[in-house]
């Protein structure tokens, strides 16, 4: 015979074809072998011109031989070489599917590989590719979009060889809160890292507000609305500034009375105050906290103390906010002017967290009376709020 070729090569099959001998022959003897593969020999009819090779090993170079027989006579042998395809990984599955994450797992191919190419694509056409190592059989997908259909494909690699792709389809779950109205809802969406987040007042996407979320203190889910830490920001500001807010949310800042009013109008909120000074820490929690609107001059409601700092906010309960240019306190003198800050002053303060940073003069500094008195300016202070029923919401999410 002549013209021996292979066609339709896969990872486990190939088709051998040849030109028949000119003379009539009784049969053809076909043999094929590969590295670490025992030789297989088959005899076929003399009028056959092709033979299906099966049960081949993947990614293996085979040597194929064929000769003709007529009675006791044998023709010369012709030879061809071919390499089977790399077989595909198997059983690609998406598990642990969340709103923004999923875990892909697969079984490796029979052939040795040098890696895998993973491709995942959303219905909007966003495609991402990643190459992972040869010993990997799972991969965590992150930064996915909620409520989105994805097609994930995987292909084995071995040098220049590439297997066929296999695929799986999955859909990420929807966010519990597509437009979180506070940091607790952001946390219940699965965001557990403290930092900047966008919240939506009353869940309205038109009312976006960038806030700093504390996701670690006492279970997390806190909107930080005041931070003092280094004295770089000027807190001796006017009414307009305190209404709107000022500063860098990552550093020292005040979120704004208008924002506090809108946030606390969304439901029942609790207040947490964290204080730190020369390695000492203290905290105060109030289970009822709200700030009125501009008509009430942002009247404070704060009740239900627990903690280690001492109940210094009770003195300010029911008071309107005061700044040097809008004196609403009950003192004859202007408390904000006297103490170079702003607060829900009475006459004047037990708490002066917006006082002069580092000023240890009586009542002038960052004070929390029942912790460090009025003659010590506290180094670090944060005020933050979250829904009073956060513990219940958190438990419900865990059960879900």
């Amino acid at each position: 015979p002549s013209g021996l070729v292979t066609a339709n090569i896969t990872d486990s099959e190939a088709l051998a074809r040849w030109q028949p001998a000119i003379a009539t022959v009784d049969s053809y003897v076909i043999s094929y072998t590969g590295e670490k593969v025992p030789e297989i020999t088959r005899t076929v009819s003399g009028n056959t011109v092709e033979y299906a090779l099966t049960d081949l090993e993947p990614a293996t170079e085979y040597t194929l031989r064929i000769f003709a027989e007529k009675g006791p006579q044998k023709s010369s042998t012709i030879t061809a070489k071919f390499t089977t395809d790399l077989d595909s990984p198997r059983d690609l599955t998406a598990t642990e599917v969340q709103s923004e994450t999923a875990l892909l797992t697969w079984r490796p191919p029979r052939a040795s590989v040098t890696g895998y190419l993973l491709v995942y694509e959303s219905v909007d056409g966003t495609v991402k590719e990643v190459i992972v190592g040869p010993d990997t059989t799972s991969y965590s997908l992150a930064d996915l979009s909620p409520s989105t259909h994805y097609t994930a494909k995987i292909q084995a690699l071995n040098g220049p060889l590439r297997s066929n792709m296999i695929q799986t389809i999955f859909t990420t779950i929807g966010l519990l809160y597509p437009f979180p109205k506070d940091c607790s809802q952001a946390m219940l969406n699965g965001d557990t890292t403290s930092g900047l987040y966008t919240i939506y007042l009353n869940g309205d996407k038109a009312e976006a507000l960038e806030v700093f979320c504390d996701m670690t203190s006492d279970g997390g889910g806190w909107i930080v609305f005041l931070r003092r830490k280094n004295g770089r920001e000027n807190f001796y500001q006017n009414w307009k500034a305190y209404a709107a807010g000022f500063g860098d949310r990552r550093e020292e800042f005040w979120l704004g009375l208008d924002n506090l009013n809108k946030i606390t109008a969304q439901g029942q909120y609790e207040l947490r105050v964290d204080l730190r000074d020369h390695g000492e820490t203290a905290f105060a929690v109030y289970d009822k906290f709200s700030v009125g609107d501009a008509k009430t001059r942002y009247k404070l409601k704060v009740e239900g103390y627990s903690g280690t700092a001492g109940d210094s906010m009770a003195y300010h309960n029911g008071r309107s906010f005061s700044t040097f240019d809008k004196d609403t306190d009950s003192a004859i003198t202007n408390c904000a002017l006297s103490y170079k800050g702003a607060f829900w002053y009475r006459n004047c303060h037990r708490v002066n967290l917006m006082g002069r940073y580092g000023d240890n003069n009586h009542s002038q500094g960052v004070n929390w009376f029942h912790w460090k008195g009025h003659e010590h300016s506290i180094q670090f202070a944060e005020m933050k709020l979250r829904p009073s029923n956060f513990r219940n919401l958190e438990g419900r999410r865990k059960r879900a």
């Epitope: 009740e303 103390y305 109940d311 009770a314 003195y315 309960n317 009950s330 003192a331 004859i332 003198t333 009475r346 006459n347 004047c348 303060h349 009586h362 009542s363 009025h374």
Partner: antibody
Framework: QVQLVESGGGLVQPGRSLRLSCAAS????????MHWVRQAPGKGLEWVSG????????YYADSVKGRFTISRDNAKNSLYLQMNSLRAEDTALYYC?????????????WGQGTMVTVSS | DIQMTQSPSSLSASVGDRVTITCRAS??????LNWYQQKPGKAPKLLIY???NLETGVPSRFSGSGSGTDFTLTISSLQPEDFATYYC?????????FGQGTKVDIK
């Protein structure tokens, strides 16, 4: 309207004990801190002790610290002052007073007082 | 403890007079200062809290001022029912302390 009625006063020998009570009505008792203030015959006012609305924080004048204990039973709308190791100088009219808030702030409304006489 | 010193200890005045009583704290107390009136055989009555805030129901002839360490109670026009003993009290820190009292009697 707010009413505070003290009881439990009387004549007692030095070194003995006495327990004063104050029955409160006309307001949500556990929303307010309470005080004991005394006045020796012909003398001025002396703050003795105070307790927060929850009962979680208590405060004392140095002259009674370690001898007197303030407590409250919010379920019974009652304030108490347990006075041990009584001395002659503890002789006074003892007033209970309601604060304006839940923490130590301003004694606002006062009862009519109960007389304690320490004498042998 | 914070000492509270009132002056004068006593004063005689006539109906219609303007009367001023002062109170000095031994240390800075912001505006944590209250004034009480006590009549013989009666319990003290809160007149002014937070140095200058008139308690509900107290006549407007009573007024308070001051902050820090020096405070004043003023009765703008003394009435017959105002003859009594007046006490200042600091609520800045515990133990709370009272002044020794100022007795206002009829001249």
């Amino acid at each position: 309207q707010v009413q505070l009625v003290e009881s439990g006063g009387g004549l007692v020998q030095p070194g003995r004990s006495l327990r004063l009570s104050c029955a409160a009505s006309g307001f949500t008792f556990d929303d307010y801190a309470m005080h004991w203030v005394r006045q020796a015959p012909g003398k001025g006012l002396e703050w003795v002790s105070g307790i927060s609305g929850s009962g979680g924080s208590t405060y004392y004048a140095d002259s009674v610290k370690g001898r007197f204990t303030i407590s409250r039973d919010n379920a019974k709308n009652s304030l108490y002052l347990q006075m041990n190791s009584l001395r002659a100088e503890d002789t006074a009219l003892y007033y209970c007073a309601k604060d304006i808030s839940a923490v130590m702030d301003v004694p606002q409304t006062w009862g009519q007082g109960t007389m304690v006489t320490v004498s042998s | 403890d914070i000492q509270m010193t009132q002056s004068p200890s006593s004063l005689s005045a006539s109906v219609g007079d303007r009367v001023t009583i002062t109170c000095r704290a031994s240390q800075y107390i912001q505006g944590f200062l209250n004034w009480y009136q006590q009549k013989p055989g009666k319990a003290p009555k809160l007149l002014i809290y937070d140095a200058s805030n008139l308690e509900t129901g107290v006549p407007s002839r009573f007024s308070g001022s001051g902050s820090g360490t020096d405070f004043t109670l003023t009765i703008s026009s003394l009435q017959p029912e105002d003859f009594a003993t007046y006490y200042c009290q600091q609520s800045y820190s515990t133990p709370q302390t009272f002044g020794q009292g100022t007795k206002v009697d009829i001249k």
